[in-house]
């Protein structure tokens, strides 16, 4: 039961982590105009990895794509991969982890099949997080960086002649957004891997033991590990000696190595 | 079309308080903001503050603050500007007008002429 | 406050003639964020309200005839009127709509000989 839950928990938090990761790159306030010890400007500027908008005092809203793709800073370039190799391996992630969940019976998988896709789409998951905050760190860090140059810079010539004011910009809410999708989907990988320990058998499995009433002689029937339908199903390493026939799904066990008859 | 309708004129005396209304028809009143604006007899216009109908956002002009107080009632789709503490100075023309791109005011009312005097 | 030095103070001018007004503003009106400039032009006619004429500092209000033509970036603007008409008799300001406190120019006002 314990797997299930944190197999389960660990896809629901994935999931609202890779959507989270999702409206932050679309999100357009990834930074916002510093409005401290700024003169009061009757407009606000904004921008996001695809376009930058302008809010005036009006309710105005003017948004311009970044239609050139060449002429971009490298940083948003990197930054916009990042997020996007995010969301695409969190998407992947996610679609391996509905087949992974063990609530769901996908014709006769094996729970070693299960535990590799919950393993692999973990694995996906802690990636797709990392990018994620990588992306967004990076971009944290280009604002910084130009914040204070800025600063420095308060007012910068046109020309020599004109005085305009130097736009400042700090963390938008996207950032933010950025920063908890990608903890979020970084936890629900790590769960989803912690849930595939529980899931996959310690060792390869042995053939079951079968014993028979009628005679001394020992039969090892093929058998190995079947799909059980409960999570879980605690089987514990025990040995039947008596001399009773049973089938193979009543001796099921994990034997280990020096477990002889 | 657009309309800004304004109240009439006022005669008040120093030391007393004035309440101006505009009037609002032709447009979703919520969605624009509404901006009043001064002029002196022979002088140039001053801004005095706008406000939103739509969430009672204001801003005032710091000259104005204490002294002008804008409000709205959005089920008359009418703005209202309350100014106190009136002296002679204040004598003017105000209007009304309504935000549009580049913050500009693109439809204005008529103006109500306010005379302080004793 | 920003200060809007509009000049000259009045003018006077025959039909069909070309007029340039101009206005200065003591700081960039420029946003570097869509590069557009917050400056507008109106014209007041005597006993009545003013009226649009130019936003951004060069974007036309519709129904504003095609003679009015704004310019400039920056601190300097400029408002032409390409064949003056007997209706153009009015004064004419500027107004910075980018920095707070909104402040208008002193106004230019147009005479028609």
């Known amino acids: 039961m314990a797997v299930t839950a944190c197999q389960g928990l660990g896809f629901v938090v994935s999931l609202i982590g890779i959507a989270g990761i999702i409206a932050a790159t679309c999100m357009d306030q990834w930074s916002t105009q510093d409005l401290y010890n700024n003169p009061v400007t009757a407009v606000f500027n904004y921008q996001g990895l695809w376009r930058s908008c302008v809010r005036e005092s009006s309710g105005f809203t003017e948004c311009r794509g970044y239609f050139t793709l060449l002429g971009l800073p490298a940083m948003l370039q990197a930054v916009r991969a990042l997020m996007i190799v995010g969301i695409v391996l969190g998407a992947i992630g996610l679609l391996v982890s509905i087949f992974a969940l063990k609530c769901i019976r996908i014709g006769s998988m094996e729970d070693s099949a299960k535990a590799n896709m919950t393993l692999t789409s973990g694995i996906m998951f802690i990636v797709s997080g990392l990018c994620a905050i990588a992306g967004v760190s990076v971009f944290a860090n280009m604002l910084v960086t130009n914040f204070w140059m800025s600063t420095a810079n308060m007012y910068t010539g046109m020309g020599g002649m004109v005085q305009t004011v130097q736009t400042r910009y700090t963390f938008g809410a996207a950032l933010f957004v950025g920063w908890v999708a990608g903890g979020l989907t970084l936890i629900g990988g790590v769960m989803m891997c912690i849930a595939c320990r529980g899931l996959a058998p310690e060792e390869t499995n042995y053939k079951a033991v079968s014993y028979h009433a009628s005679g001394h002689s020992v039969a090892y029937k093929p058998g190995g590990f079947k799909a059980s339908t409960g999570f879980g199903s605690n089987t514990k390493n025990k040995k039947i000696y008596d001399g009773g026939a049973r089938t193979e799904d009543e001796v099921q066990s994990y034997p280990s190595k020096h477990d002889y008859v | 079309q657009v309309q800004l309708q304004q109240s009439g004129a006022e005669l008040v005396k120093p030391g007393t308080s004035v309440k101006l209304s505009c009037k609002a028809s032709?447009?979703?009143?919520?969605?624009?903001?509404l901006n009043w604006v001064r002029q002196r007899p022979k002088q140039g216009l001053e801004w005095i503050g706008w406000?939103?109908?739509?969430?009672?956002?204001?801003n005032y002009n710091e000259k104005f603050q204490g002294q002008a107080t804008l409000t709205t009632d959005k089920s008359s789709s009418t703005a209202y500007m309350q100014l106190s503490r009136l002296t002679s100075e204040d004598s003017a023309v105000y209007f009304c007008?309504?935000?549009?791109?580049?913050?500009?005011?693109?439809?204005w009312g008529q103006g109500t002429l306010v005379t302080v005097s004793a | 406050d920003i200060v809007m030095t509009q000049s000259p103070s009045s003018l006077t001018v025959t039909a069909g003639e070309k007029v340039t007004m101009s206005c200065k503003s003591s700081q960039s009106l420029l946003n570097s964020g869509n590069l557009r400039n917050y400056l507008t032009w109106y014209q007041q006619k005597p006993g009545r309200p003013p009226k649009l004429l130019i936003y951004?500092?060069?974007t036309r209000e519709s129904g504003v005839p095609d003679r009015f033509t704004g310019s400039g970036s920056g601190t300097d603007f400029t408002l032409t009127i390409s064949s003056v008409q007997a209706e153009d008799l009015a004064v004419y300001y500027c107004?910075?709509?980018?920095?707070?406190?909104?402040?208008f120019g002193a106004g230019t006002k147009l005479e028609i000989k």
């Open positions: 007008a309504r935000f549009y791109y580049g913050n500009s005011l693109n439809y």
């Open positions: 951004w500092a060069s």
């Open positions: 107004q910075n709509n980018y920095f707070y406190p909104l402040t």
């Open positions: 032709g447009y979703s009143f919520t969605t624009y903001g």
């Open positions: 406000i939103f109908p739509g969430d009672g956002n204001v």
